[in-house]
C-alpha cells in the first residue's frame, strides 16, 4: 500500500477535467492538489464523478478548509453537496441567494434531505428573517417548505413575503401554522378589493377567527366546501345558519354531503333545527324546537 501514496509519474493533475474519472480513489488522493480543486470547483459538476470519487474530493476540501468552506467554493459544490453532512454545513456562512439556489438545484425533484434542511436553516438564520426572495426560492423548490416550519419560526415571516405564497404551499399546514400566517396575510392583502382579496386570502382562512368569517359572509364570496371544511371549528360554531348560507352562496348544498364531518357536524349540533330546515337540505341533528340552550362556558366565566 505504501507505493500507492505517491502520485505515479505523469499523472499529476494540471487541471480538473474529465480524464480524472479514470483515476482510482488513491490516485485522486495522491494526484489532485486541494488548492487546484478549490479554484476549479465549477468544473466538478460537469464531470461524472462516482460516489467514491466524490468522497475523495470532499476529503481534500475538508483538509484544505477545516473551519468550513468559503462561499466561493460552496457555490460551485454541485453534486459534491450531496456528500456533506449537516455538521459540515453548520460550519458554513452562506449569504448569497445564488449560492442557495445552486445547492437546492442539486437536490431538485427529491425530498428535502437533512443537508438541505440544515442549509436552509443556516441561510434563514443568517438573514434574520424569511424575506420574500428567499421564500420565493424555497417554495419553488419545496412547495411544502412553509408548512415544515414551527409557528415560532413562521412568526419571523414578514407580511410582505406572503405575496410569494401559492395555495399549494399551504396544503400540509396545520391549524397552528395557519393561525400565525393568517394575520400576516390579512395585513398583506388589506388594500385589495373584495373579490381579489378573497382569492388571495382563501388559502389562509384555516387561521381566520369568527368575526372575519362573519365579515366575509357579507361580501358574496361564494366560498367552496373544500375551503369551508378547513376552517377552524371554533371559528365556525358561532356562525348562524344565515351567515353560513351567505358565506357559501350556491355551494351551501354541499353541506349535506359533509354533515357527518367536522366542522359541519359540530356546527349542525349548535343550530336550531328550525333554522337548518330553512336551507331545505335535510340536515338533521340541530337543537329541537322549544329547547333552551344554555351556554355553560359563559356561566363558568361569570362564576
Amino acid at each position: 500500500e505504501v507505493e500507492k501514496t505517491a502520485c505515479p509519474s505523469g499523472k499529476k493533475a494540471r487541471e480538473i477535467d474529465e480524464s480524472l474519472i479514470f483515476y482510482k480513489k488513491w490516485e485522486l488522493e495522491a494526484c489532485v492538489d486541494a488548492a487546484l480543486l478549490a479554484t476549479q470547483m465549477d468544473r466538478v459538476n460537469a464531470i461524472p464523478f462516482t460516489y467514491e470519487q466524490l468522497d475523495v474530493l470532499k476529503h481534500k476540501l475538508d483538509e484544505l478548509y477545516p473551519q468550513g468552506y468559503p462561499e466561493s467554493v460552496i457555490q460551485h459544490l454541485g453534486y459534491l453537496f450531496l456528500k456533506m453532512s449537516p455538521e459540515d454545513i453548520r460550519k458554513w456562512n452562506v449569504t448569497s441567494l445564488e449560492t442557495l439556489k445552486a445547492l437546492l438545484e442539486v437536490n431538485k425533484g427529491h425530498e428535502m434531505s437533512p443537508q438541505v434542511a440544515t442549509l436552509i436553516d443556516r441561510f434563514v438564520k443568517g438573514r434574520g428573517q424569511l424575506d420574500k426572495d428567499t421564500l420565493d426560492t424555497l417554495t419553488a423548490f419545496y412547495p411544502g417548505y412553509l408548512c415544515s416550519l414551527s409557528p415560532e419560526e413562521l412568526s419571523s415571516v414578514p407580511p410582505s413575503s406572503i405575496w410569494a405564497v401559492r395555495p399549494q404551499d399551504l396544503d400540509t399546514c396545520d391549524p397552528r401554522q395557519l393561525d400565525v400566517l393568517y394575520p400576516k396575510a390579512r395585513l398583506a392583502f388589506q388594500n385589495m378589493n373584495g373579490s381579489e382579496y378573497f382569492v388571495k386570502i382563501q388559502s389562509f382562512l384555516g387561521g381566520a377567527p369568527t368575526e372575519d368569517l362573519k365579515a366575509l359572509s357579507q361580501q358574496n364570496v361564494s366560498m367552496d366546501l373544500a375551503t369551508f371544511m378547513k376552517l377552524r371549528t371554533d371559528a365556525v360554531l358561532p356562525l348562524t345558519v344565515a351567515e353560513v348560507q351567505k358565506l357559501l352562496g350556491p355551494h351551501v348544498e354541499g353541506l349535506k354531503a359533509e354533515e357527518r364531518h367536522r366542522p359541519v357536524r359540530d356546527w349542525i349540533l349548535r343550530q336550531r333545527q328550525d333554522d337548518l330546515d330553512t336551507l331545505g337540505l335535510g340536515l338533521q341533528g340541530g337543537i329541537p324546537n322549544g329547547y333552551l340552550v344554555l351556554d355553560l362556558s359563559m356561566q363558568e366565566a361569570l362564576s
Epitope: 460537469a46 464531470i47 461524472p48 460516489y51 453534486y79 450531496l82 437536490n107 425533484g109
Partner: nanobody
Framework: VQLVESGGGLVQPGGSLRLSCAAS????????VAWYRQAPGEQREPVAA???????IYADSVKGRFTISRDNAKNTVYLQMNSLKPEDTAVYYC??????????WGQGTSVTVS
C-alpha cells in the same frame, strides 16, 4: 431517478452493439453522464463519459471502437460498440448526476462477446 439500460446481448468477436440508457427526469440533458462496465469478479470501471458541456472521453481499452452520445429530446444516452472483443464481456451501466453521486444504479445490460 430511474435508469434503464438496454441493447445488450450475445455477439461474435468483431461484431457491433448499440446500448441505450433511458433516464427519468431531465438527468441526461443537464448532467455529465458515463457508461461503466463490470466484468465477473471485477470492480465496476468507467468506459466512456460525456461532460455536461458535451465533450467526450474514453478508456484506453475502447478508444476508437466505442462512441458515447446522447439525445436530449429522448432523455437517452447511447454507447455504440464496434469491433467487439471477448474482453468487452461485462454488464454495462450508465449513470450521471444525482443518482451517480448518491450511488444509485440501474440493472445494467449484459454484453457477451463469444
Amino acid at each position: 431517478v430511474q435508469l434503464v439500460e438496454s441493447g445488450g446481448g450475445l455477439v461474435q468477436p468483431g461484431g457491433s452493439l448499440r446500448l441505450s440508457c433511458a433516464a427519468s427526469g431531465s438527468m441526461v440533458s443537464i448532467n455529465a453522464v458515463a457508461w461503466y462496465r463490470q466484468a465477473p469478479g471485477e470492480q465496476r470501471e468507467p468506459v466512456a463519459a460525456m461532460t455536461s458541456g458535451g465533450s467526450t472521453i474514453y478508456a484506453d481499452s475502447v478508444k476508437g471502437r466505442f462512441t458515447i452520445s446522447r439525445d436530449n429530446a429522448k432523455n437517452t444516452v447511447y454507447l455504440q460498440m464496434n469491433s467487439l472483443k471477448p474482453e468487452d464481456t461485462a454488464v454495462y451501466y450508465c449513470n450521471g448526476g444525482w443518482s451517480l453521486a448518491m450511488d444509485y444504479w440501474g440493472q445494467g445490460t449484459s454484453v457477451t462477446v463469444s
